[in-house]
Every structure is written in structure tokens, then in C-alpha cells.
Interface confidence: low
């Protein structure tokens, strides 16, 4: 068959599977006169043979792992054995079959992992090799965990990268591994060739012993510190420790206090630096941070809680310079006159703020001293000896000592003797009729005026009238304000009226005095009045459950992710349709029925966070009334902005020729968020070809110095490419260009002959 299995002498390549016994010839070369025979040379390995007539074949199975390519040469000879054609290269490519099993480099691996390590971060690699061709499935290895011992609640704490053999913690492992419970684990790992996909794959296993080490980066127990300490400061109160030596510790005050009285040293010991005052602040919460030598946080911050313990450093204080009470003449012994309530700034419900009351003086002492008692702990004043007479003594003044366990304070009480309360308030009418109001009547509206009168002594507690709604308004929608001069009552709306829950309310008022009635006198029907409130329906707009809805997501969430939801109800029970208003960036969509909010485009914290939109709830049907609420989407940062130059650096120049190597300083920035630390950029030259002329050296996390390595520069502009890496997750890199001109200078400035004025650098170095 001319062409496929036979033909003239020319360079050719053949592919033959290894491991197969010969079953057919490779090729039949045809001789062109004067050629009569053929000769084979090269890497024949005594396997490849050519018969004189040009029949190329092999005589036994090939082995790719011994030789993957046989480079042969075929020449055509004339009758005298002289080469007349060729030699031409003949390449035999040996195709792989899966005839080698993978083998682990070690039969046993050992490693350790710290509890709470980041999931997915490799802490150990297992490695296997397979002699088969890695470009084919035969040599493509697939790693798997066969078993984890112990296995708790059927949860895998470890995972392996099927391709690389990297062993790391799962999320559950990161959260649950605890050396106190289980200090060691054993994994049996298998490796299969054929990418693990074939029943005919070969495999090997290895054993991995893993020690779990304690994570000592833990928040300490809450600390109690006594206020106003007189001990020398600073005083060590607690400590944190990073897992390895060399960490740099700092404290972060999230509350941004004007005075932050704590510090930390480089051992991780935390100190209070000055006396604390519980009455100024009774507890502190701040954070301890551990950073590496470059200022990068090593882990999450730890929360430190300090509770300030009270001492008795505050005396009792009186409620006012003089406290005034009223007592009716002829009141009975033991009646309550009023309660003196003093205060103490020390901690509530402790001995430091527990107060005692004692009357130390009564003036006048008429008709005798000791007319009043005060309850030692409650501060309630009572009539002690006899009824009082206004015409004898219309006013008494008491001096009362109020004490805690260490301090005493004097408070002053004035007691006015008033006429007896033997008259009840009488309503001018007992029924104020019907009143019809729409349910959307404004809160604060006065809807009714009521009036009762009392014949007791004017402007005393015996004649003052307090109006109460005792029936018909369990929701507290109405209230009554009293004019103290006229005792007129103004009925006002305190909460929205609601047709749906209370269409008709039968309201009953009671008029009372703050002073008790004398013995034998009782309130009767004259002190009660009623009216009927009829509420009419108004189609009301839907009501949101909150004025502002907030949600927080990472700025890199996938399109279509649910980022929040809002809820509203219609008072009339109609269905609600939700929509968005003010989505200027086109980032969001809302499910009209459920109120769930989804992202529909990539979010970007750097464009502004929080992102504020309005959500609208509209009745379906009815009069389509709508309400508006706010939705605030707080975007959490991911590292998605490469570093760049902080400003425009055009116009940098050196005076030519350089008398000595020179340098200039530049600054980098990026738009991502940098919590607990500033940016921490690393700098390098953007290409290897620059290294003969320039070097770049880091000054700090944001600044670097570009220096010349020699003085032999041409008089022209050089564009120096700088690579800036932000070390983030993922690390992002920016390549920036610094244009530097070497020019002749006059008085320290670049000199250009007339006509060459464009782009003159303006900054000399």
C-alpha cells in the first residue's frame, strides 16, 4: 500500500506503543536506482532491523521507560555498498502504556499542624512518582485520603489536594481540632495513576502521622481592675502570646477613647498605665494584635475585656437642694408623706451605694419634736405622732442625713401642711358623646377637652386633678394632659389610631387627686365620665418593619448572591410588591414578592461603602399606596486593587554627567482597605535588564528609593519600570514607570536649547 506502509526514502516519524509484541512491519522503503540496498544505524538497541530490500521492522516489545524516542538513520547503498541516498532521520516515538505503578517517596510521613490554622493552607506534602508519561493519564497522579483516625462524628478534619498532595485542614478541622482532646491523627493516603479515573489504575498507599499543636494565641480571661489604684503604674493585668517568638505586639482601641490607659510590651504582657475611674468608664474592650517583622498581622486580633471594680469613692447626693412634700391636716398616723430618693454614683446594688436615711433635725419643733419618721433604707417619710394643724404650723423643715458605708450627706425636705382632701373632683358632664376620627389623624392632636372641678384648697394636691383613662384604651393610643391652673384636661392622640384593630372604643375617664381622700370620703360616679371614639378606615400605605435595613457582604460576592432582604406589611392585608429606587450603580435587584435583594453586577467597595438605595413597598391592588425605607449594603474589602504610584512623577532628572551615583524617593499606594496596619508594599525592578543600571530599595511599607548603580548614563530619558507587590490575599502587583531624564544643567535645572522645550523635567535629583 503505497504511502502508508511503503514509499521512497525520506525523513519520517513513527509512533509505536510500548509493551506490544511486533505484529506488523513499520515501513517498506523503495529503492531508486542506482540504490539497491538499505542500511540502518543509530539507536537500534538491537530491536530495530532493516532488511536489505528496505523492510523496516522491530523484533521485540519496546519499553518507553528505557528509551522514549529512538533516533535512527536509514541510508540507500549502491551495488558497491556506497551511500547514494541519505542517510535520512527516522524517528520512532514510543507511546506510553500504563505499565508502572505510582510509588510514594516515603512509606511514612510525619507533620504537625497548629489548631485553628487557616483551612486550605497546606502544612504537609506527600509525594509519589510514576515512571509512566506524565503527559498522559498513565502518569497523572491522583491523591486521596483513604481514612482518618480517629474520625469523630464522621467529620473529616483534613483534606488533600488531589493533584499536588498538599494536606491541609478542612473548615471543620480549623474550628474543632483540639490537642487537649486528640493530640494526634493518622491518615492513610492513596495515590492512583490514570488520574484516579480508571478501574485499571495502579495505586500505592502511605501513612501520615499528624501532631496537633496548641494554638496559644487565645483571648485571656476577662480582667478585673480596682478603680483608683494607688499602686505604682504601669501594672501588668494580663498577657497574650503568639505561637512563635519574634512577634510584634500592639493594642487597638476600637472605641477611639480620648484616654486609652493600656499598653503592651514585646513579650505580650498587657499593662494598665494609670488609675481607672469606674464612674467614668466601668469596662473596656480592646484588641491585641500580633504582627510579623514586616508589620503584617499574623492572625486575627484578640479581644481583651477589662472590668473596673468599684470602690466607695462617691458620697450620696440629694435629688434637689430642697425636696417639697405635702401633708393634709388631720392625716392619720403612719400615712406616707413622700419618699426622699438620694443617689450614689458608686456601683448599683452594692454596699458602696446602699443608702441609710436618718432625720437629724425638725424645725419648728411644734407642737413637739419627732413628728416625722423616715424609713431607714427606703427613704419614705411618714407621720409619726399626731395629725397636723395648718393654722398652728403651715410648714416644717427637715434635715435628713443620707449615708453609705463611708460618707454622709445632709438633704433638706420642706413639708407643707395643706387643707384636708374632703372634696372629690366632679366632672362638668358625665358623657362627652361620640367623636368620629379618621385613623390617620396626627399624633399629638387634641381631640377633646374635659373638665372637672374640686372644691379643696386651690393649688394643693387636694384640689389638683389628674385624669386617667381607666377603660377602653388598652393599647394606650390616647393620653390626657392637665392644665395645672385650670384643671382642664386635653385628650390627645399618643399612638396611631387603627380602624383594623379598634373601630369603636368606649372610653372611661377618672378624675383623681394626687393627695389621698380623708377617711370616709370616696370617689363616686361624679368623678367618672365617658365618651365614644369612632375610627374611620383610611387606606394606609404598607409599613416596613425597619426604617433602615442593613446587610454586610464581601465586595467580591458572586453575581446572583442574596445580599439582604426587607419586609413590609400592609395594614389592610393586601399583597405587597417590592422595588428598588436609587440603584445608581445598577448593582442590585429585588424579588418583587419576597423582598430578597440580590447582586446583579460586580460590587466594588472602593466605589463607595455603604451603598445606599431605597426600597419601595407598594400595595398590589387597592390604591397602590407605597412606602419607602433605606437599604444600606456594607461592602467588606478584598484585595482587588494593585499598587500604583501615589502621585505624578513626571519631571524627575539628574544633571548630566553624573558626578556620583544619585537616588530619588517615590511613594506607592493602593485603594484597598488596610486594617490594623498601613500598606506593606515590596518593590523590585520591573525587568532584569534594568539591574545593571538601577537598584530599588525599600524604605518602609509605602516608600522606596531608586538609585543609580554607576555614573555612565547617556544624556537622554530612561523609563525605569518598578514592580510593586502589595503582599495581600491574593498578592496583587502593579508595574509602574518612573521616567528619569539625564540632562545638561544650568544652575541646577535642565538646559534645553530653544526649540527643545517640550517635556522639560522640573525636579532635579
Amino acid at each position: 500500500q503505497e504511502g502508508k506502509f511503503s514509499g521512497p526514502l525520506k525523513p519520517m516519524t513513527f509512533s509505536i506503543y510500548e509493551g506490544q509484541e511486533p505484529s506488523q512491519i513499520i515501513f517498506q522503503f523503495k529503492a531508486n536506482p542506482p540504490a539497491v540496498t538499505f542500511e540502518l544505524t543509530g539507536e537500534t538497541d538491537n530491536i530495530f532491523v532493516i532488511e536489505r530490500e528496505g523492510l523496516l521492522y522491530y523484533n521485540r516489545a519496546l519499553d518507553r521507560e528505557t528509551r522514549s524516542t529512538h533516533n535512527l538513520q536509514v541510508a540507500a547503498l549502491d551495488a558497491n555498498g556506497i551511500i547514494v541516498e541519505g542517510p535520512v532521520p527516522i524517528t520512532i516515538k514510543v507511546k506510553d502504556i500504563n505499565d508502572n505503578r505510582p510509588t510514594f517517596l516515603q512509606s511514612k510521613y510525619e507533620g504537625s499542624v497548629r489548631q485553628n490554622s487557616r483551612p486550605g493552607k497546606p502544612f504537609l506534602y506527600v509525594n509519589a512518582t510514576d515512571l509512566d508519561d506524565p503527559a498522559t493519564p498513565n502518569g497523572q497522579l491522583y491523591y486521596q485520603i483513604v481514612i482518618q483516625l480517629p474520625m469523630i462524628n464522621n467529620v473529616m478534619y483534613f483534606q488533600i489536594n488531589n493533584k499536588t498532595g498538599a494536606i491541609s485542614l478542612t473548615r471543620e478541622g480549623s474550628q474543632e481540632l483540639n490537642p487537649a482532646k486528640n493530640p494526634s491523627y493518622n491518615l492513610v493516603i492513596s495515590v492512583k495513576d490514570m488520574g484516579g479515573q480508571s478501574e485499571n489504575s495502579f495505586s500505592d498507599t502511605t501513612s501520615v502521622d499528624i501532631i496537633v499543636t496548641e494554638n496559644i494565641w487565645k483571648a485571656p480571661k476577662p480582667v478585673e481592675m480596682v478603680e483608683n489604684s494607688t499602686d505604682p503604674h504601669p501594672i501588668k493585668i494580663t498577657q497574650v502570646r503568639w505561637n512563635d517568638p519574634g512577634a510584634q505586639y500592639s493594642l487597638v482601641d476600637k472605641e477611639k477613647l480620648p484616654r486609652f490607659p493600656f499598653s503592651i510590651d514585646q513579650e505580650g504582657d498587657i499593662y494598665v498605665t494609670q488609675p481607672l475611674d469606674r464612674e467614668e468608664k466601668d469596662a473596656y474592650v480592646f484588641y491585641a494584635v500580633a504582627k510579623d517583622e514586616y508589620g503584617k498581622p499574623l492572625s486575627y486580633p484578640l479581644e481583651i475585656h477589662v472590668k473596673v471594680k468599684d470602690i466607695n469613692d462617691n458620697p450620696p447626693t440629694c435629688p434637689s437642694p430642697v425636696t417639697v412634700f405635702e401633708v393634709q391636716e388631720n392625716e392619720r398616723l403612719g400615712n406616707s408623706i413622700g419618699t426622699l430618693t438620694a443617689h450614689d454614683r458608686d456601683e448599683e446594688n452594692t454596699a458602696n451605694s446602699f443608702l441609710n436615711y436618718r432625720i437629724v433635725e425638725q424645725t419648728p419643733k411644734l407642737p413637739m419634736d419627732g413628728l416625722f419618721l423616715i424609713q431607714t433604707y427606703a427613704g419614705m417619710l411618714q407621720l409619726a405622732k399626731q395629725s397636723l394643724k395648718k393654722q398652728d404650723t403651715p410648714q416644717y423643715n427637715l434635715t435628713i442625713e443620707v449615708s453609705d458605708k463611708d460618707f454622709k450627706t445632709l438633704c433638706f425636705v420642706q413639708i407643707n401642711v395643706i387643707d384636708i382632701n374632703d372634696q372629690i373632683p366632679i366632672f362638668e358632664k358625665s358623657d362627652y358623646g361620640n367623636l368620629t376620627l379618621a385613623e390617620d389623624t396626627n399624633i399629638g392632636s387634641t381631640i377633646l377637652t374635659i373638665q372637672a372641678t374640686d372644691a379643696d384648697e386651690p393649688f394643693t394636691g387636694s384640689s389638683k386633678i389628674l385624669y386617667h383613662i381607666i377603660k377602653g384604651d388598652s393599647e394606650g393610643r390616647l393620653g390626657v394632659d392637665t392644665d395645672p391652673h385650670t384643671n382642664t384636661g386635653y385628650v390627645i392622640i399618643k399612638k396611631p389610631l387603627d380602624f383594623e384593630t379598634a373601630a369603636v372604643s368606649n372610653i372611661v375617664f377618672k378624675a383623681e387627686n394626687p393627695e389621698p381622700l380623708v377617711f370616709g370620703v370616696k370617689y363616686n360616679a361624679s368623678s367618672f365620665a365617658k365618651f365614644t371614639l369612632i375610627v374611620t378606615d383610611v387606606n394606609e400605605a404598607p409599613q416596613f418593619s425597619q426604617h433602615v435595613f442593613q446587610a454586610k457582604v464581601s465586595e467580591d460576592v458572586a453575581i446572583g448572591t442574596k445580599v439582604g432582604n426587607v419586609t413590609a406589611k400592609d395594614p389592610e392585608g393586601l399583597d405587597i410588591s417590592y422595588s428598588l429606587r436609587g440603584d445608581t450603580r445598577g448593582w442590585l435587584k429585588i424579588d418583587h414578592v419576597t423582598g430578597e435583594i440580590f447582586s446583579v453586577a460586580p460590587l466594588d467597595r472602593e466605589a463607595g461603602s455603604p451603598y445606599r438605595v431605597q426600597v419601595v413597598a407598594t400595595e398590589v391592588g387597592g390604591s397602590s399606596l407605597s412606602s419607602v425605607s433605606e437599604f444600606h449594603l456594607i461592602l467588606m474589602d478584598v484585595n482587588d486593587n494593585p499598587p500604583r504610584l501615589a502621585k505624578d512623577y513626571t519631571g524627575l532628572f539628574f544633571c548630566h554627567p553624573l558626578s556620583a551615583p544619585g537616588s530619588l524617593i517615590f511613594e506607592a499606594t493602593d485603594d484597598d482597605q488596610h486594617l490594623f496596619r498601613g500598606p506593606h508594599f515590596t518593590f523590585s525592578l520591573g525587568s532584569g535588564s534594568l539591574q545593571n543600571d538601577w537598584e530599588v530599595s525599600k524604605i518602609n511599607g509605602t516608600h522606596a528609593r531608586l538609585s543609580t548603580r554607576h555614573t555612565e548614563f547617556e544624556e537622554r530619558e530612561y523609563v525605569v519600570l518598578i514592580r510593586i507587590n502589595d503582599g495581600g490575599r491574593p498578592p496583587l502587583e502593579g508595574i509602574v514607570s518612573l521616567p528619569v531624564t539625564f540632562c545638561s544643567c544650568v544652575e541646577g535645572s535642565c538646559f534645553r536649547p530653544a526649540g527643545h522645550q517640550t517635556g522639560i523635567p522640573t525636579v532635579g535629583m
Partner: nanobody, 124 residues
């Protein structure tokens, strides 16, 4: 389980362009960081480009920077590699890969799902 299917390879002259596509099935593409790798004959598989779940972060090998662009359309469950100014040394089998680690835009070299590959040949 997630499966990846590459397409768009072929023969192109130096300086020409190709656009590779990687269709993701079995799961939503937006759950995965995605990458393109390539393997030239007789060489190890090498990283070409990768893109985060949202498409917000892209990374490239130095050898393709400025010529290749990786992008994704999560609505279509597809990742693309636009290859311009192709050179003979770009000849390789191009593989699409998925990184299912739970980190959003964090990349380890943890690509754990691979496609079968598509051949790209740059030759005059």
C-alpha cells in the same frame, strides 16, 4: 460534580488571535476561581492566567501579560481566554481548571478540577 470542557483551539499564524472557552457544568461557575494552564510537548504544565469567583481579580504569567486576557461570564457558566499576538512558543495544549477553595478571591495553587485540554498550534 463539576466538569470542564474547553473549546476554541486550533492552528493560527504568528501574530494571530484565538479565543478559548471553558464551559462549566455540574455546578455554578461562580462558586469557583478559574484558571488556564498549558503544557507544551516535552514540558511541564505551566500556569497561564486565573480569575477570581467574581471576576474582580485576575493574575497572569509574565510570559503572557499584555497579550492574553482572562474573563468570565457567570450567567453563561463560561470562562474565556482571549489570546492576541500569538507566538510559536505559545503552542501547547491549554487546560481549563477550577479552584473550589472557600476563599472567594484567595488563590492557592489548589486547582482541583481539570478539563481535557484543547490544542493550540502557532505556526506559519
Amino acid at each position: 460534580e463539576v466538569q470542564l470542557l474547553e473549546s476554541g483551539g486550533g492552528l493560527v499564524q504568528p501574530g494571530g488571535s484565538l479565543r478559548l472557552s471553558c464551559a462549566v457544568s455540574g455546578r455554578t461557575a461562580s462558586e469557583y476561581g478559574m484558571g488556564w494552564f498549558r503544557q507544551a510537548p516535552g514540558k511541564e504544565r505551566e500556569f497561564v492566567a486565573r480569575i477570581s469567583t467574581s471576576g474582580g481579580v485576575t493574575r497572569y504569567a509574565d510570559s503572557v501579560k499584555g497579550r492574553f486576557t482572562i474573563s468570565r461570564d457567570n450567567a453563561k457558566n463560561t470562562v474565556y481566554l482571549q489570546m492576541n499576538s500569538l507566538r510559536p512558543e505559545d503552542t501547547a495544549v491549554y487546560y481549563c481548571a477550577a479552584d473550589g477553595l472557600p476563599y472567594g478571591d484567595w488563590f492557592g495553587d489548589q486547582f482541583d478540577v481539570w478539563g481535557q485540554g484543547t490544542q493550540v498550534t502557532v505556526s506559519s
